[in-house]
C-alpha cells in the first residue's frame, strides 16, 4: 500500500471518558494536523476510516460499527459511543485516504469510572475567580453537540456530594453556575449533571470543574520585600556563616511570573568568585498569593565578602523591587561597603 | 480618616418604604466591599446585606430577601438600601460598614434608627 | 448557615482580672473570624480579625486565639473602658453570622 503520514500517537489528547455515558470524539486530524476540514476532505473524495488498539494490546484492529443500538457509530469526522463501556479504553487512530493519499494520527482514550460523589481518576479543568467580585459564572463544560437546541436538557448542579440547592451565594441557572462575591469557602469541585432524552432513551453528561479562589485584580500589587530591611544588620566576624534570607510577597496577578534574586556587587551570584549558597522556597496563601524565600549563604565569610554589597531584587508583572543587607563586620562601626 | 454616614432612617407604617444612604469618605470607596447590619432594641447584631466593590454582585439575608435592595454609587461614595415591604421586626439601628474578606467589617458608620410602627 | 453560639452571656470581672470569652461556630470556619466591642449607644469596633490579628490601634491587651469550630477572646487585665458588649462573627461562608454577644460587666 501505498505510505502514510503518520502522526504518531497525539499524547497532547488524553482523552477521558466517564463509563455508562456518552461520548464524541473529533478526529484530531481536522483540528491540528491539516490545513483543511473534514467537509473539504470528504469532497474532495477523501474518506475517513477508524480502527483501535485495545489497552494493552499491539494488535489494531477496525471498530466495531455493527454494535446494538449502534453503540459506536461515527458521524462525519466524528466517532460517537452511545454510551461507553469501561473495555473501550484504547488508542484509537482516525484515518484519511484515498488512493492517492493517506495521514493518519492516533490519540489515547480513557474510559473512566465515577463513584455516587463523583470521584474519579478524570483530570478536571480548574477555574479561577477573583476574591469579591460581583459575580463569576462557570459554565457546564463539554456538552456542546450532544443533543440538537430543540432539545432542552435537565441540569442538575452539586458542590462535592451536595446538590447546590439553597447555597447562599452560589446560584444554579441552567447550563450556568453563578458565584456572587465568591469567598475561599466556594473552593471546591463542582459537577454539573446533564440529563437528555435521545431515541426513547435518557443519556446523563458529568462534567466536573474545580473551582479556586484566587486575589483580585485591584490588590495586585509590585513585589514586597519584607527582608532584607532596614532594621536588620548582619554583623559578623571573618570564618563565621553568613545566611541572609530575601523574602519577598507576591500579590496574586493571573499568569504572572513572578522572579526573586540576589546580586553581590551589582553581579549575579553566578559571576562571583565567592563560594555561595541560595536555596529557595515557596509558599502559598489561600487566594495563592505567594511569599517566595531565597536563602543566600556564605559558610565562611571573609572580611572581603563583609564589604560587599548585598541586594535582594524582585519583579512580577506590577513592577520591581529590590533591597540591599545591611552587613557589617563585628566590632567595625562601618555598615556601608568600605572602599579602600 | 475612614468614615461612613448613614442618614434616611425614621418612623414609618408597616407596608411602607424607605432607602437609606452611607457616605464614605478617607478611603477608596470603589475598592471596598459594603454591607448592612442591623441591630434591634436590645438585641444582637444581624447581617442584612452585602455588595461587592464593583456593584455588580450583591446578597441578602434571607429575612429581607426580596423586599430589600442594595447597590452603590461609586462616582459618589455612596452606599444605599431600599428597604420596601416594611415590618414591625425591621426595627432596628442600621449601620453601614465596609469589608474585605481577610478582616470582614473593619469600619462602621454610627447607625441610623428605622422603626417600623403604626 | 452557620450559627454562632458565645459564651457565657454575661461575664462579671473586676477591673485587672483577665476576661475569657468563647464563641464556637456549627461547622468549620477556619481562621476566618473577628471580635468586636460595642458599647452603648455606639456602634460595633473591629477588635480581632483573622481569629488572631489585632485590628489597627487595638491595645495588646486583647488577644484571640483558636480555629476551625472554637474561638477565645481573652482580655488579660480589664480596663475600666473594657466592660462591654463582645460579638464573634463568622465570615468564612455567606451568610456572615453573629453570635448573640457577652456582656462584659463590672463585679
Known amino acids: 500500500s501505498e505510505r502514510c503520514d503518520d502522526w504518531g500517537l497525539d499524547t497532547m489528547r488524553q482523552i477521558q471518558v466517564f463509563e455508562d455515558e456518552p461520548a464524541r470524539i473529533k478526529c484530531p486530524l481536522f483540528e491540528h494536523f491539516l490545513k483543511y476540514n473534514y467537509s473539504t476532505a470528504h469532497s474532495s473524495g477523501l474518506t475517513l476510516i477508524w480502527y483501535w488498539t485495545r489497552q494493552d494490546r499491539d494488535l489494531e484492529e477496525p471498530i466495531n460499527f455493527r454494535l446494538p443500538e449502534n453503540r459506536i457509530s461515527k458521524e462525519k469526522d466524528v466517532l460517537w459511543f452511545r454510551p461507553t463501556l469501561l473495555n473501550d479504553t484504547g488508542n484509537y487512530t482516525c484515518m484519511l485516504r484515498n488512493t492517492t493519499y493517506c495521514s493518519k494520527v492516533a490519540f489515547p482514550l480513557e474510559v473512566v469510572q465515577k463513584d455516587s460523589c463523583f470521584n474519579s481518576a478524570m483530570r478536571f479543568p480548574v477555574h479561577k475567580m477573583y476574591i469579591e467580585h460581583g459575580i463569576h459564572k462557570i459554565t457546564c463544560p463539554n456538552v456542546d453537540g450532544y443533543f440538537p437546541s430543540s432539545v432542552k436538557p435537565s441540569v442538575t448542579w452539586y458542590k462535592g456530594c451536595t446538590e447546590i440547592v439553597d447555597f447562599h451565594n452560589v446560584l444554579p441557572e441552567g447550563m450556568n453556575l453563578s458565584f456572587f462575591i465568591p469567598l475561599v469557602s466556594n473552593n471546591g469541585n463542582y459537577t454539573c449533571v446533564v440529563t437528555y432524552p435521545e431515541n426513547g432513551r435518557l443519556f446523563h453528561l458529568t462534567r466536573t470543574v474545580t473551582v479556586k479562589v484566587v486575589g483580585s485584580p485591584k490588590d495586585a500589587l509590585p513585589p514586597q520585600i519584607y527582608s532584607p530591611n532596614d532594621r536588620v544588620v548582619y554583623e559578623k566576624e571573618p570564618g563565621e556563616e553568613l545566611v541572609i534570607p530575601c523574602k519577598v510577597y507576591f500579590s496574586f496577578i493571573m499568569d504572572s511570573h513572578n522572579e526573586v534574586w540576589w546580586t553581590i556587587d551589582g553581579k549575579k551570584p553566578d559571576d562571583v568568585t565567592v563560594d555561595i549558597t541560595i536555596n529557595e522556597s515557596v509558599s502559598y496563601s489561600s487566594t495563592e498569593d505567594e511569599t517566595r524565600t531565597q536563602i543566600l549563604s556564605i559558610k565562611k565569610v571573609t572580611p572581603e565578602d563583609l564589604r560587599r554589597n548585598y541586594v535582594c531584587h524582585a519583579r512580577n508583572t506590577k513592577g520591581e523591587a529590590e533591597q540591599a543587607a545591611k552587613v557589617k563586620q563585628k566590632g567595625n562601626g562601618c555598615t556601608e561597603p568600605m572602599t579602600l | 480618616e475612614v468614615q461612613l454616614l448613614e442618614s434616611g432612617g425614621g418612623l414609618v407604617q408597616p407596608g411602607g418604604s424607605l432607602r437609606l444612604s452611607c457616605a464614605a469618605s478617607?478611603?477608596?470607596?470603589?475598592?471596598?466591599?459594603m454591607g448592612w447590619v442591623r441591630q434591634a432594641p436590645g438585641k444582637g447584631l444581624e447581617w442584612v446585606s452585602a455588595i461587592s466593590y464593583d456593584g455588580e454582585g450583591t446578597l441578602y439575608a434571607d429575612s429581607v430577601k426580596g423586599r430589600f435592595t442594595i447597590s452603590r454609587d461609586n462616582s459618589k461614595n455612596t452606599l444605599y438600601l431600599q428597604m420596601n415591604s416594611l415590618r414591625a421586626e425591621d426595627t432596628a439601628v442600621y449601620y453601614c460598614?465596609?469589608?474585605?474578606?481577610?478582616?470582614?467589617?473593619?469600619?462602621w458608620g454610627q447607625g441610623t434608627l428605622v422603626t417600623v410602627s403604626s | 448557615e452557620i450559627v454562632m453560639t458565645q459564651s457565657p452571656a454575661t461575664l462579671s470581672v473586676s477591673p485587672g482580672e483577665r476576661a475569657t470569652l468563647s464563641c464556637r461556630a456549627s461547622?468549620?470556619?477556619?481562621?476566618?473570624l473577628a471580635w468586636y466591642q460595642q458599647k452603648p449607644g455606639q456602634a460595633p469596633r473591629l477588635l480581632i480579625y483573622?481569629?488572631?490579628t489585632r485590628a489597627t490601634g487595638i491595645p495588646a491587651r486583647f488577644s484571640g486565639s483558636g480555629s476551625g469550630t472554637e474561638f477565645t477572646l481573652t482580655i488579660s487585665s480589664l480596663q475600666s473602658e473594657d466592660f462591654a458588649v463582645y460579638y464573634c462573627?463568622?465570615?468564612?461562608?455567606?451568610?456572615?453570622?453573629f453570635g448573640q454577644g457577652t456582656k462584659v460587666e463590672i463585679k
Open positions: 460598614a465596609r469589608f474585605r474578606y481577610y478582616t470582614a467589617f473593619d469600619y
Open positions: 461547622q468549620s470556619v477556619s481562621s476566618n
Open positions: 462573627q463568622q465570615y468564612n461562608n455567606w451568610p456572615w453570622t
Open positions: 478617607g478611603f477608596i470607596f470603589s475598592t471596598y466591599g
Open positions: 483573622g481569629a488572631s
